[in-house]
Interface confidence: low
């Protein structure tokens, strides 16, 4: 892969992701084979000249070859790069102002792997740009200052690949202070720092902070401050916890809008293509369970054999080819027995009883299901687990200390600094990092080399 390119040759340092030091012909790059190859290789690049912003350029690139072009930036701006490549392609995209980039000399570098659904180069200095790969289209955004910028697409695969790209100027993106030092993501002019970094410009390294410094730690979970979300309060409200929405949706204003057939906060659950099942069934585990008399993927097909018999529960009307059903029977073929209760919107009547969709229970499918463990120490009341004396927690699985003795619970509920679990013989606290003691109430010293 291209990870070998991220390790610079000795003798140069990086500042904000920019390779410094004088370029020279003695620059070398460590190639995948492990050997050193002089940068001044002949016949190893294709130059297509200056590319116009907004116009798509296409080039076939042999393996091990750079395709080079230039873009002239007349005023500082955010530029969105749309790059199309084959599904098995592996490319490195190098961008450098003023001079042609090499494996070792560049201002920005992106790694594009056609096999990956989405890819972000993991080293903090490279994570300044968001990069997504949908099918064969990669998109990333870079802030480019005035000047002539040189692009180089390096084919790190085994085969010739057809590559094309175009660039679009983004007006709405504002610049961030010092480009977040490469330690954060710039969103509308505000730095959202990656874990381990703090400050308006993400310049300060930080010790691990509970709730990322963006929330209050309480009872084992983070209560996020306004504008933040996620288990660690590390995701801005206008972003999605899973930016790819499980590969089954799009992130819009911080919420996943799921593709047909998927649901859930992160589009991680399989849903029916028509969640209503055409009003003739219920959706269970992503499949429509149809009411009698109905069939098809979405219960959209009226299914009857020999309707003139009306399932033995009605009278056939030959003039219209329809059944007039006996009392307590319904449906086009009188095959649906009327339930004694209305199954509502979360169930269908099958054989005189309500069959509930996922997450619902009760004779009329009108009660939300609780976690199966709720019944151990509580009672389920419409999706909420009401705990018996001495128990608490969402599913009534956490015992409470009574009169200073440890009965079936943990000391002081682990003080919110641990998880209460049932060991071999008793309940005990499993403390979070930085806490110890039977009740996780003793803070441990931690040393941070800032």
């Amino acid at each position: 892969g291209l990870n070998w390119q991220l390790q610079p040759a000795d003798g140069h340092t990086f500042n904000n992701g920019i390779r410094t030091g004088l370029p020279g012909n003695d620059d070398v790059a460590t190639m995948p084979s492990g050997g050193k190859v002089p940068w001044s290789l002949k016949n190893s690049s294709i130059d297509s000249g200056e590319a116009e912003v907004g116009r798509r350029v296409t080039q076939e690139v042999p393996p091990g070859v750079f395709w080079r072009s230039q873009i002239h930036i007349s005023q500082p701006q955010f530029l969105k790069f749309n790059i199309s490549l084959g599904k098995d392609a592996l490319f490195g995209v190098y961008i450098r102002r003023g001079l042609p980039p090499s494996h070792a000399q560049y201002d920005f570098m992106e790694r594009l792997d056609g096999k990956e659904k989405w890819s972000v180069v993991e080293s903090p200095r490279e994570r300044r740009s968001i990069q997504t790969l949908v099918q064969n289209e990669a998109v990333f955004v870079q802030y480019l200052d005035v000047g002539l910028w040189h692009l180089a697409f390096y084919n790190d695969g085994k085969d010739k690949e057809m590559v094309s790209f175009n660039t679009v100027v983004l007006d709405s993106v504002q610049d961030c202070p010092r480009n977040c030092h490469g330690n954060g993501e710039c969103v509308s002019g505000v730095c959202h720092c990656f874990p381990g970094f703090l400050g308006a410009d993400c310049a300060k390294a930080a010790c691990p902070v509970l709730c990322s410094g963006n929330g209050q730690y309480s009872k084992g979970t983070c209560q996020c401050y306004s504008g933040w979300k996620g288990a660690e309060c590390d995701v801005p409200m206008n972003q999605c916890i899973d930016p790819s929405c499980g590969g089954h949706g799009s992130c819009i204003d911080g919420n996943c809008v799921c593709s047909a057939g998927y649901k859930g906060e992160h589009c991680e659950e399989v849903d029916c293509l028509d969640p209503t099942c055409s009003s003739h069934g219920v959706c269970v585990n992503g499949e429509c369970l149809c009411s009698p008399g109905w069939g098809g993927l979405n219960c959209e097909l009226a299914r009857v054999q020999c309707p003139d018999q009306c399932s033995g529960h009605g009278t056939y009307l030959p003039d219209t080819g329809l059944c007039s059903c006996d009392p307590n029977w319904m449906g086009p073929d009188c095959s649906v027995e009327v339930c004694s209760v209305d199954c509502g919107t979360h169930g269908v009547c099958i054989g005189g009883a309500c069959r509930c969709e996922e997450g619902w229970t009760g004779a009329a499918c009108d009660q939300r299901v609780c976690h199966p463990r709720c019944i151990e120490h509580g009672t389920c009341k419409d999706g909420k687990c009401e705990c018996r004396e001495g128990w608490n927690g969402e599913h009534c699985t956490i015992g409470r200390q009574t009169a200073g003795t440890e009965t079936d619970g943990c000391p002081d509920l682990c003080n919110g600094n641990g998880r209460c679990t049932l060991g071999q013989n008793s309940w005990q606290c499993v403390c979070q990092t930085g806490w110890r003691g039977p009740g996780c109430n003793v803070a441990m010293e931690t040393s941070c080399a800032d």
Partner: antibody, heavy 127, light 108 residues
Framework: QVQLQESGPGLVKPSETLSLTCTVS????????WSWIRQPPGKGLEWIGY???????NYNPSLKSRVTISVDTSKNQFSLKLSSVTAADTAVYYC?????????????????????WGQGTTVTVSS | EIVLTQFPGTLSLSPGESAPLSCRAS???????LVWYQQKPGQAPRLLIY???SRATGIPDRFSVSGSGTDFTLTISRLEPEDFAVYYC?????????FGPGTKVDIK
């Protein structure tokens, strides 16, 4: 012989709710679908939605936020409510029986069609 | 939604002539999901053909339907005076169940 009769006010003020009732006579409302269709002056037909006698509904998405179709099997009636009306809702409103016929000895052929219609009622939206 | 287009908009013919009325769908529709109606001035529409080729009660055999996929034709083989009206196609292939704009058959 099944017959349908629409009833309701012929004049509705803008932003108010249009309410129409369709009375089914000469047969039972059970075991059928019942539809509402409208036709603006000099224009074509627009399907509004249907209700199954058990209460299941299906609405035209373009009107879904404003439309409610309900059924009263005891009165052999079904009704249409269209909220927040504007002049664009001026039309002849028809109720119809929407059959689902599955011919004998054919499992998957399901035939549809509105075989019985009311004579229509004109609704004008104006202040 | 499936958009139905009907053409011609108006067909001027004499009694006894044949009238081909076209209905085109924006996406494929099963022939059994296409329905045809006839509407005369001041009257409600009347079901003509349903289920590919089934004629509704009382509809004479001079009315027939052909076609599949996206292109369908209602043919009135010998126009009678009572056949001059507006004809609508409607699809039940997917909700919403849309109608075509209609074709008016009038006397030349």
């Amino acid at each position: 012989q099944v017959q349908l009769q629409e009833s309701g006010p012929g004049l509705v003020k803008p932003s108010e709710t249009l309410s129409l009732t369709c009375t089914v006579s000469g047969g039972s409302i059970s075991s059928y679908y019942w539809s509402w269709i409208r036709q603006p002056p000099g224009k074509g037909l627009e399907w509004i939605g249907y209700i199954y006698y058990s209460g299941n509904t299906n609405y035209n998405p373009s009107l879904k936020s404003r439309v409610t179709i309900s059924v009263d099997t005891s009165k052999n009636q079904f009704s249409l409510k269209l909220s927040s009306v504007t002049a664009a809702d001026t039309a002849v409103y028809y109720c119809a029986r929407d059959i689902v016929v599955v011919p004998a000895a054919r499992d998957y052929d399901y035939y549809y069609g509105m075989d019985v219609w009311g004579q229509g009622t004109t609704v004008t939206v104006s202040s | 939604e499936i958009v139905l287009t009907q053409f011609p908009g108006t067909l001027s013919l004499s009694p006894g002539e044949s009238a081909p009325l076209s209905c085109r769908a924006s996406q494929s529709v099963s022939s059994i999901d296409l329905v045809w109606y006839q509407q005369k001035p001041g009257q409600a529409p009347r079901l003509l053909i349903y289920g590919a080729s089934s004629r509704a009660t009382g509809i004479p055999d001079r009315f027939s339907v052909s076609g599949s996929g996206t292109d369908f034709t209602l043919t009135i083989s010998r126009l009678e005076p009572e056949d001059f009206a507006v004809y609508y196609c409607q699809q039940y292939g997917s909700s919403p169940f849309t109608f075509g704009p209609g074709t008016k058959v009038d006397i030349k």
